[in-house]
Structures are given as structure tokens and as C-alpha cells.
Interface confidence: medium
């Protein structure tokens, strides 16, 4: 539930659709000009838990292109540049909102969808399970 | 641009608004039930570049609550549990889509907005600038 201080200049909404269906202006207000994660930083190469970026494309989704991180190694890169399997490279995941065309192929009708994406990788100490 | 084979059952859209303004169903299709990042994993504590999660709250935005990562240290945690300043903890950032109420305070009218959020931190080798 979101607190909504009602503005008298709002578009009308029929009760049967409210608050499920809303109008959304797709002219994105973008505070960030760089949308290619490969150009935004080279952390994916310099990290001790490096990752590759894979392009996930779906024309029925908005945005249609999402970049997914896949950790390169199970372990982490140590000071000598070797993979240390005493540590683990793990993906950092985030839930993001996307718009899914609904009904399919409709240009102006969408449904909000939450998807889980891997944004990058981090190096963690493994959880050790001791066997009695 | 993406070619969209038009579905005859789509809602109508007036040309003057098309394709800027679309209808969006806010009944989120959610494949992931856990939305609190503190509960989803303990990577933020176990990472060699640990981070804290800060709650960013804005009722004029959807989603109104977003969790932001802030790296705990400039350096990374070494095998002894100490901060090693020869390495750097850096935030992994991602651009995400949110809905911003427009006009302000309207319950059923939004504009898409891209915001940059820090999702977690990773440990990177620093860039060394050699002075001639």
C-alpha cells in the first residue's frame, strides 16, 4: 500500500480498475546517461570475483535488454592471480521491476513484473558445515 | 525499436499519446517471494567487501522502498580479518526502472524513471597511476 495524497488534477480512474491499472508515461526520466554496464566500470574484470555479462533479450518485456552477471570462477582470485577455492565467488542478486506486455504483443498494455537479476559478483567466506 | 505484431485484443491507444503513455497493471507478477535483501542472503556480512543496507523511502515512487548498499570499508577484508588497503571495496551499481507519480500525488498516473542503485560491493584491484 502506498500513501497517496490525491491531486485534483489527476487523470480519472474507474473504481473497478483502481488501483490495479494505471497510466504510465514511457518517456523515461533518466538521471544516468550510461546504460551499458560494460562501459560504466571495469569492476567485472578487476574484481577478485570477476564476472561476465550476458545479454538477456525479450521483446515482450520492457526493458527488452537486461544484462546478467555470471561469476567466472567458483573461487576468488588471490594476490598471485590464481583461483583460491577456500573462498567463493557468488552473484549479488536484485529484484527489479520490468513491464511485461499483456496481452502478449500489445504495444500499449503492460503488467508489472518482478524479476531477479544477477548484477555482479562478490567474494565471500564459505559456510563450513562440520560433520559430527 | 522492436517490431511488435499487434494483437487484435489490445486496448486502443490514441495516436497523440502513442506510444508514450501506456496502461500498466500493478498486480505484480512476482517470481520471487523474498523482497527484503537482508533476509535473502547474508553475503553482505560474509563478503571480503562487506556492505550495509540503507532503506531509501519515497511514497511518490513505486516501489516506495528501495535498499541501497554502502560499502563498510575503503579496503577489503583479508584472510586475517583485517582491512587490506591494497585492495578496494567498491559498490556494484545498477540502473533500475521505477514509477514516479506524475503529476505528484496522483494514485493512477506515473512516469517511468531510471535510477542508479548500489546493490552490493565487490573487492577490486586498485588502478595504480604511475607518475613519470
Amino acid at each position: 500500500g502506498i500513501t497517496i495524497p490525491r491531486n485534483p488534477g489527476c487523470p480519472n480512474s474507474e473504481d473497478k480498475n483502481f488501483p490495479r491499472t494505471v497510466m504510465v508515461n514511457l518517456n523515461i526520466h533518466n538521471r544516468n546517461t550510461n546504460t551499458n554496464p560494460k562501459r560504466s566500470s571495469d569492476y567485472y574484470n578487476r574484481s577478485t570475483s570477476p564476472w561476465n555479462l550476458h545479454r538477456n533479450e525479450d521483446p515482450e518485456r520492457y526493458p527488452s535488454v537486461i544484462w546478467e552477471a555470471k561469476c567466472r570462477h567458483l573461487g576468488c582470485i588471490n594476490a598471485d592471480g590464481n583461483v583460491d577455492y577456500h573462498m567463493n565467488s557468488v552473484p549479488i542478486q536484485q529484484e527489479i521491476l520490468v513491464l511485461r506486455r499483456e496481452p502478449p504483443h500489445c504495444p500499449n498494455s503492460f503488467r508489472l513484473e518482478k524479476i531477479l537479476v544477477s548484477v555482479g559478483c562478490t567474494c565471500v567466506t564459505p559456510i563450513v558445515h562440520h560433520v559430527a | 525499436g522492436i517490431t511488435i505484431p499487434r494483437n487484435p485484443g489490445c486496448p486502443n491507444s490514441e495516436d497523440k499519446n502513442f506510444p508514450r503513455t501506456v496502461m500498466v497493471n500493478l498486480n505484480i507478477h512476482n517470481r520471487n517471494t523474498n523482497t527484503n535483501p537482508k533476509r535473502s542472503s547474508d553475503y553482505y556480512n560474509r563478503s571480503t567487501s562487506p556492505w550495509n543496507l540503507h532503506r531509501n523511502e519515497d511514497p511518490e515512487r513505486y516501489p516506495s522502498v528501495i535498499w541501497e548498499a554502502k560499502c563498510r570499508h575503503l579496503g577489503c577484508i583479508n584472510a586475517d580479518g583485517n582491512v587490506d588497503y591494497h585492495m578496494n571495496s567498491v559498490p556494484i551499481q545498477q540502473e533500475i526502472l521505477v514509477l514516479r507519480r506524475e503529476p505528484p500525488h496522483c494514485p493512477n498516473s506515473f512516469r517511468l524513471e531510471k535510477i542508479l542503485v548500489s546493490v552490493g560491493c565487490t573487492c577490486v584491484t586498485p588502478i595504480v597511476h604511475h607518475v613519470a
Partner: antibody, heavy 125, light 107 residues
Framework: EVQLVESGGGLVQPGGSLRLSCAAS????????MAWVRQAPGKGLEWVAT????????YYRDSVKGRFTISRDNAKNSLYLQMNSLRAEDTAVYYC??????????????????WGQGTLVTVSS | DIQLTQSPSSLSASVGDRVTITCRAD??????MHWYQQKPGKAPKLLIY???NSEIGVPDRFSGSGSGTDFRLTISSLQPEDFATYYC?????????FGQGTKVEIK
């Protein structure tokens, strides 16, 4: 522990002005929406105004719009209510209120979990 | 504005009684309904938030239920310290509104 302490109440003539203050402690003040709620003698509770953490967004009940101004100074952990053109019907105990600190759900924390002791404003000639 | 109507306005009950106070909104407030207890000369105290969540430190004899427009606060076994006035609050839309209050008195 969250503490809210109001001050600035008193007796004022109709048409006069008063500035209420609320000193907050025990939490990261700038992260939270804050509000003023009032209660006329022997009556129920009435929400007056709310302000966002940054101070950039404010909301008022219609009867005080244009007369009252809610503001905050995050550097001083202080919330204010500037009351102008006071009327007899503004007579009340004014409470400063803040949201919960521990709630981690996805709904904005805009209800009032913590309250000050209140400060009495009496508008009378 | 969303109007909240509490009933009853007052009630007399004995220690150990089960007491239910209702709050009806004239339009849906979804789950954004909260309950407060106030004693004379004191600030209100949050009991229940978001319909049914108990505030830390609130005895488990207090419970909340309902959705949309109809909500209930139940005290399963009234104790001497529970004699007070109870208010519901909606934070679904501005202006936030409180119910008119329900005074619980000793029979």
C-alpha cells in the same frame, strides 16, 4: 531510544503567531518522515502536517493550509511548526510524531510509532 | 477525505471481559490501518500497525483484524491498565484521519 520533546506552546491571541519545535534523538532523524498531530481539549486526535526526510515534500490538512508551515533542520535533529493567523479552533495539545525505526517491510513507514509529550497551544483573547 | 467511524463510542466492561472495537472507513484503506491507546494527559501509544501487527512491547491480548473498510481491535481479556480511549488511524491517503475514539470504562 527514540525521544521527541516539543516546546514553544503558550497563550496567543487570535490572528497571532507561534512556532513549535520538536527536538528528536535516538534515531537517524534525516531518514524519516515526521508529523504534527493535535488534540483539542476533550476531543479526538487530528493529523496536522507531515514532512519528508529531506524536507522537500510537505503535506497539510486543509484547515491549516496557507497558515501553518512544517519544516525541519536535519543538522539540528529538529522539527518545526510555524503557525500564523491562529484561530480559536487551533487550540490544542500539539504532538510531534515519528515513524517506527525497525519496520523493514515494503510499505512506507508513515504511521506514528513515537510521540512527544505534547505542547499546549491556547488561542484566546 | 476518508471518514473513520468507530463503534461503540464508549463501553463499560469488567476486568477479564473480551472487548471488540470496530472501525469502519467510508472507502478502502487497504491494509493501512493502525490502532492507538491513549490515557488522560498522556500521548497516544501505538498498539497495532498495518491492521494486525503488534507493536513491540504490546501485550498479546491486543489483536487487530480486518481489511479494506472494516477493521477490529480486540482485547481478549481486559486488564485494569487497559481502561483508556482507543483510536484507529488510516494512512492510506492524505489527509490522514483518526476515528473519533472509543472510551473503555470500568463497569
Amino acid at each position: 531510544e527514540v525521544q521527541l520533546v516539543e516546546s514553544g506552546g503558550g497563550l496567543v491571541q487570535p490572528g497571532g503567531s507561534l512556532r513549535l519545535s520538536c527536538a528528536a534523538s535516538g534515531f537517524r532523524f534525516s531518514d524519516y518522515y515526521m508529523a504534527w498531530v493535535r488534540q483539542a481539549p476533550g476531543k479526538g486526535l487530528e493529523w496536522v502536517a507531515t514532512i519528508s526526510g529531506s524536507g522537500g515534500t510537505t503535506y497539510y490538512r486543509d484547515s491549516v493550509k496557507g497558515r501553518f508551515t512544517i519544516s525541519r533542520d536535519n543538522a539540528k535533529n529538529s522539527l518545526y511548526l510555524q503557525m500564523n493567523s491562529l484561530r480559536a479552533e487551533d487550540t490544542a495539545v500539539y504532538y510531534c510524531a515519528s515513524p517506527p525505526q525497525y519496520y523493514e517491510g515494503s510499505i512506507p513507514r508513515l504511521w506514528f510509532a513515537h510521540w512527544g509529550q505534547g505542547t499546549l497551544v491556547t488561542v484566546s483573547s | 477525505d476518508i471518514q473513520l467511524t468507530q463503534s461503540p463510542s464508549s463501553l463499560s466492561a469488567s476486568v477479564g471481559d473480551r472487548v471488540t472495537i470496530t472501525c469502519r472507513a467510508d472507502e478502502s484503506v487497504r491494509t493501512l490501518m493502525h490502532w492507538y491507546q491513549q490515557k488522560p494527559g498522556k500521548a497516544p501509544k501505538l498498539l497495532i500497525y498495518l491492521v494486525s501487527n503488534s507493536e513491540i512491547g504490546v501485550p498479546d491480548r491486543f489483536s487487530g483484524s480486518g481489511s479494506g473498510t472494516d477493521f477490529r481491535l480486540t482485547i481478549s481479556s481486559l486488564q485494569p491498565e487497559d481502561f483508556a480511549t482507543y483510536y484507529c488511524l488510516q494512512t492510506h491517503s492524505y489527509p490522514y484521519t483518526f476515528g473519533q475514539g472509543t472510551k473503555v470504562e470500568i463497569k
